[in-house]
């Protein structure tokens, strides 16, 4: 069996990823240069490890994460780690753009770095629906697509509602979900006789994928707290998102033996439910009040997240043609929701308390933003899935779904693996 | 006691750099975000720039986008503006002044500037 | 959001009831602070997220209001409350002040 990419992709995709590889380059050279204040060097290495921590969890903690398949584990972190690179610097240009071009040169800081990695992430979370159904050629397209809708949707809720970085950038969780189910709703989906078993979960890969799920629990403080303004609104961040995704690990194992029959526990339940608090909290991390609040919500994200792997993937399959290991999806669009739910909550109970109209408005506000991320969400992901479509990307046939041996060369191998 | 105090003001061409600092006592200097603010000669305050608590993210007034450059060492206490192409209608007295961030109900932190150096005079002539 | 004062200067006695009006071109919430400046000092901050007292001031300075709409109230004037009062709002970038009223002596 042969394991080369067809020949008009071997053409394709070098000369696609290398020009626009190019073009970047160009605008960096003719738009950008770096922040040129002294800064105290401490300081600097400080800041510089919140953007390391979300590199980690982007390259290992999501790359591995979505490693699972038998068939498709070297394709899943690679092509992640593809994707996170392009989506880095085309999230710098274009935030840059959107937000400082007007006066000049965008200057690039560390600052900037950490938010196109967390731009960049939200295509990761996104790609978990279609990776395995998707060539390297497609996913620089929903790089570029992605990418520009929520740097798009960012400037408008910051311009129209005046919202936060760290608000705004909560909405990457509903917004990669939705994006991502979009798209797989619009790629071809039953997969033909003979590949059932290559979207199955194997032990090595279902390690990593363990393995990228720990990444991603250990550095989610760091996520959810990165773009705060104050020390104290960062610290009541790590701590609230600690709390709640410590909780969430407890549920999820303990809630994975309980909704199976013989009490065992599944692993695609535990590598995805880890992370529900983390994604719960995230709104609103910096406003909890105390550590038990944190705590129950990590426990009901847990039993949403487990709950939701147990009876969800059976109707992902069929609707969307997402294989059961690939709930990052939906398990962040229900996750993401409650998130913004919490903070609507907090909203109302602050009007009740202070009998302040204007924070009545807030939540009218709070529900707009939420709207909008969704609609712009779906919106860009069927568009994306439309183009994806195209037969120009030459995307792999149904049979050669979930294949590494499709993109890489194995000589020990000859067939399978 | 909780203080800050600037520095570097003078008389300066108009053209000219100048380099103003603010050094702070009394408080955990890398824990606040930091403003300079300044006010011409009989005029109200004008909000110049402001530099998160790690420095890792700054805002100008358009009035001196690309000319005036913030930053901070916070292993040194002190908060920095760096002020090139200087016109004459920069001429004011320069304030530093550290942001407070403050939860009130449970779902919203408010910024004030809760403490103000006695500031620096810089005046930009020819 | 620019900030409109009013009046931009006003004549009162000690004991008097002062009050200062501030309007925002948009709404900024309560996002909106309340500061005194003597001639030759530093300004003072008075009040905070629009109704919020800062510590240390005397309890005769209020302040209420959201939306477009805010007011300062010293409920009985002293002496050493003759200063020009500036508000400013931190609602979004840029933040901006203000053009101030001052008190002044009868």
């Known amino acids: 069996m042969s394991s080369k990419y067809p020949r008009s992709v071997r053409r394709c995709l070098p000369l696609w990823a290398l020009t626009l590889e190019a073009a970047l380059i160009l605008l960096f050279y003719f738009f950008t240069h770096y922040d040129a204040s002294l800064e105290d060097q401490k300081g600097l290495v400080a800041s510089y490890q919140v953007g390391q921590d979300l590199t980690v969890m982007a390259a290992i903690g999501l790359g591995f994460l979505t490693s699972s398949f038998r068939r498709h584990s070297w394709s899943s972190v690679a092509f992640n780690l593809f994707m996170l690179a392009l989506g880095v610097q085309w999230a710098i240009l274009l935030d840059g753009f959107l937000s400082q071009f007007p006066s000049g040169k965008v200057v690039i800081t560390l600052f900037s770095i950490r938010l196109a990695t967390m731009s960049a992430l939200s295509v990761l979370i996104s790609v978990d629906a279609v990776l395995g159904k998707v060539n390297l050629a497609q996913l620089v397209v929903m790089v570029l697509v992605e990418v520009t809708a929520l740097g798009n949707l960012r400037m408008v809720i910051s311009n129209i509602f005046n919202t936060d970085y760290h608000m705004n950038m909560m909405h990457i969780y509903v917004f990669a979900a939705y994006f991502g189910l979009s798209v797989a709703w619009c790629l071809p989906k039953p997969l033909p006789e003979g590949t059932e078993d290559k979207d199955q979960t194997a032990t090595i890969p279902s390690l990593s994928a363990m393995l990228g799920a720990l990444f991603l629990w250990m550095f989610w403080p760091s996520f959810n707290s990165a773009l705060l303004r104050s020390p104290i609104e960062r610290k009541n961040a790590v701590f609230n998102t600690y709390y709640a995704v410590a909780v969430s690990v407890v549920t999820a194992i303990s809630g994975s033996s309980l909704a199976h029959p013989q009490g065992k526990i599944s692993k695609t339940y535990v590598h995805s439910a880890v992370l529900a608090g983390g994604v719960a909290v995230g709104t609103s991390c910096h406003l909890i009040p105390s550590p038990w609040l944190a705590m129950v919500l990590g426990l009901v994200a847990g039993l949403i997240s487990v709950g939701g792997a147990k009876y969800l993937p059976g109707c992902c399959n069929r609707v969307l043609g997402i294989p059961h290991s690939s709930i990052m999806g939906y398990n962040f669009s229900l996750l993401g929701l409650l998130g913004e739910i919490i903070y609507i909550v907090l909203l109302v109970l602050d009007t009740v308390g202070a009998g302040n109209g204007m924070i009545g408005f807030q939540v009218l506000l709070s529900i707009g933003e939420l709207s909008l991320a969704i609609v712009i969400a779906l919106m860009s992901g069927l568009l994306t899935g439309l183009l994806l479509n195209l037969k120009i990307w030459k995307a792999p046939h149904e049979a050669k779904y979930f294949d590494d041996q499709v993109f890489w060369k194995f000589p020990h191998l000859a067939v399978g693996f | 006691e909780v203080q800050l105090l600037e520095s570097g003001g003078g008389v300066v061409q108009p053209g000219r750099s100048l380099r103003l600092a603010c050094a702070a006592s009394?408080?955990?200097?890398?824990?606040?975000?930091m403003h300079w603010v300044r006010q011409a000669p009989g005029r109200g305050l004008e909000w110049v720039a402001f530099?998160?608590?790690?420095?890792?993210?700054?805002y100008y007034v358009d009035s001196v986008k690309g000319r005036f450059t913030i930053s901070r060492d916070n292993s040194k206490n002190t908060l920095y503006l760096e002020m090139n192409s200087l016109r004459v209608d920069d001429t004011a007295v320069y304030y530093c002044?550290?942001?407070?961030?403050?939860?009130?109900?449970?779902?919203?932190?408010?910024?004030?500037?809760?403490?103000w150096g006695p500031g620096t005079t810089v005046t930009v002539s020819s | 959001a620019e900030l409109t004062q009013s009046p931009s200067s006003l004549s009162a006695s000690v004991g008097d009831r002062v009050t200062v009006t501030c309007r925002a071109s948009?709404?900024?919430?309560?996002?909106l602070n309340w500061y005194q400046q003597k001639p030759g000092k530093a300004p003072k901050l008075l009040i905070y997220?629009?109704?919020s007292l800062q510590s240390g001031v005397p309890s005769r300075f209020s302040g209420s209001g959201s939306g477009t709409d805010f007011t300062l109230t010293i409920s009985s004037l002293q002496p050493e409350d003759f200063a020009t009062y500036y508000c400013?709002?931190?609602?979004?970038?840029?933040?901006?002040f203000g053009q101030g009223t001052k008190v002044e002596i009868k």
């Open positions: 002044a550290r942001e407070a961030s403050m939860l009130r109900g449970i779902s919203r932190y408010y910024y004030a500037m809760d403490v």
């Open positions: 009394g408080f955990s200097f890398r824990s606040y975000g």
């Open positions: 948009q709404s900024i919430s309560s996002y």
């Open positions: 530099t998160w608590f790690d420095g890792s993210n700054k």
């Open positions: 997220a629009a109704s």
């Open positions: 400013q709002q931190s609602y979004s970038t840029p933040w901006t």
